[in-house]
């Protein structure tokens, strides 16, 4: 990153070089020589989504005009280092990881957007972005400081499978019970139906006062 600043100063100062001593011009011309190191930047912390997906940007300051770039994601946990995934791409082309890779990514200039999926709590660790400028020579290597990815597994309900079975059984029982009740009620109503009924509301006076509560004051005959 600093290298870009040095080059910018060089461009601005070159306007005035005619009035400056040759030694200064010589010095300015050679400033870029001290800026060859490649620097890689990535976020310090990222929290994975509840679905176990984490995304972060890996940005590098390219010292040369690279046409072939290799990006590798390394995981460091308990001083153990493992390669998570890697992809080589041509500048201007899309970044493609292997089919079985847990990583996907897109590239835009000197920036790579990385997505790691299928993460679980045990995958929490430092994920380091390693960038290599493969072609043309010379080869350049840059390694980021790492992104600490935190993965929290979603808390499952206690005995969720068991509760699901209970819920299914109760629901099924209620459904069949209501089905049976409806069937019985309908059959009783059909038996009681008189062939003389016209389908209008008819006032039914009680025959015995003490039994009044056993009958509805109105009923709707069903055709």
């Amino acid at each position: 990153m600093a290298c870009l600043g040095f080059q910018r100063h060089k461009a601005q100062l070159n306007l005035a070089t005619r009035t400056w001593p040759c030694t200064l011009l010589f010095f300015l011309l050679f400033i870029p020589v001290f800026c060859k190191a490649m620097h890689v930047a990535q976020p310090a912390v990222v929290l994975a989504s509840s679905r176990g997906i984490a995304s972060f940007v890996c940005e590098y300051a390219s010292p040369g005009k690279a046409t072939e770039v290799r990006v590798t994601v390394l995981r460091q946990a308990d001083s153990q280092v493992t390669e998570v995934c890697a992809a080589t791409y041509m500048m201007g082309n899309e970044l493609t990881f292997l089919d079985d890779s847990i990583c996907t990514g897109t590239s835009s200039g000197n920036q790579v957007n990385l997505t790691i999926q299928g993460l679980r709590a045990m995958d929490t660790g430092l994920y380091i972005c390693k960038v290599e400028l493969m072609y043309p020579p010379p080869y350049y290597l840059g390694i980021g400081n790492g992104t600490q990815i935190y993965v929290i597994d979603p808390e499952p309900c206690p005995d969720s499978d068991f509760l699901l079975w209970i819920l299914a059984a109760v629901s099924s029982g209620l459904f069949f019970y209501s089905f049976l009740l409806t069937a019985v009620s309908l059959s009783k109503m059909l038996k009681k139906r008189s062939p003389l009924t016209t389908g209008v509301y008819v006032k039914m006076p009680p025959t015995e006062p003490e039994c009044e509560k056993q009958f509805q004051p109105y009923f709707i005959p069903i055709n």
């Epitope: 190191a37 280092v81 290597l141 390694i143």
Partner: antibody, heavy 118, light 108 residues
Framework: QVQLVESGGGVVQPGSSLRLSCAAS????????MHWVRQAPGKGLEWVAV????????HYADSVKGRFTTSRDNSKNTLHLQMNSLRAEDTAVYFC???????????WGQGTLVTVSS | EIVLTQSPGTLSLSPGERATLSCRAS???????LAWYQQKPGQAPRLLIY???SRATGIPDRFSGSGSGTDFTLTISRLEPEDFAVYYC?????????FGPGTKVDIK
């Protein structure tokens, strides 16, 4: 544990050729870049060459460019250094070394001595 | 190529003393791409520090590395008898990779 064993060293005449080999074990050979580093008697370390994990890329020190070629056989866990047009100044102990994930050399073999003398 | 210069050439110290070794690069080196190695007579080198300041597996915490840009330092806080050896710095950020000429730490 990681083991690297070099072989093929010996005494040769200037202008002749020699092929060094390095047998690797104790790690996934096909996942690591491999280096050759040499050390002239009583002198310091000099980096010679590197080959990528899959053999796709190779880089050499200016002093050996065009004369030395490194190759690898991942099926046999073996690394090679073909040395042509040997000079007296190529006399050294040649170390085979593993490239770590972070790019540095993390494990070394014990070395094999190459003497170029008439 | 990047030229690495180490100083001093020889460092004469007693066990228990602090050793400070310097490595200077001819041009800027990414701090993530500088390593330190220890070599004892008749043995292969051993990785001590990588990425300028990260200790390799199994390296005691008396060894520490620091620096950035063109100036890097290896510090041995308290010299143990087994620490008397030659120390090399190496840059692996730009090809060709290069080693420094080494600093010999010997017993005073």
């Amino acid at each position: 544990q990681v083991q690297l064993v070099e072989s093929g060293g010996g005494v040769v005449q200037p202008g002749s050729s020699l092929r060094l080999s390095c047998a690797a074990s104790g790690f996934t050979f096909s996942s690591h870049g491999m280096h050759w580093v040499r050390q002239a008697p009583g002198k310091g370390l000099e980096w010679v060459a590197v080959i990528w994990y899959d053999g796709s890329n190779k880089h050499y020190a200016d002093s050996v460019k065009g004369r030395f070629t490194t190759s690898r056989d991942n099926s046999k866990n073996t690394l090679h250094l073909q040395m042509n047009s040997l000079r007296a100044e190529d006399t050294a102990v040649y170390f085979c070394a593993r490239g770590g994930y972070f790019g540095c050399v993390d494990y070394w073999g014990q070395g094999t001595l190459v003497t170029v003398s008439s | 190529e990047i030229v690495l210069t180490q100083s001093p050439g020889t460092l004469s110290l007693s066990p228990g003393e602090r050793a400070t070794l310097s490595c200077r690069a001819s041009q800027s080196v990414s701090s993530s791409c500088l390593a330190w190695y220890q070599q004892k007579p008749g043995q292969a080198p051993r990785l001590l520090i990588y990425g300028a300041s990260s200790r390799a597996t199994g390296i005691p915490d008396r060894f520490s590395g620091s620096g950035s840009g063109t100036d890097f330092t290896l510090t041995i806080s308290r010299l143990e008898p087994e620490d008397f050896a030659v120390y090399y710095c190496q840059q692996y950020g730009i090809s060709p990779f290069t080693f420094g000429p080494g600093t010999k730490v010997d017993i005073k």
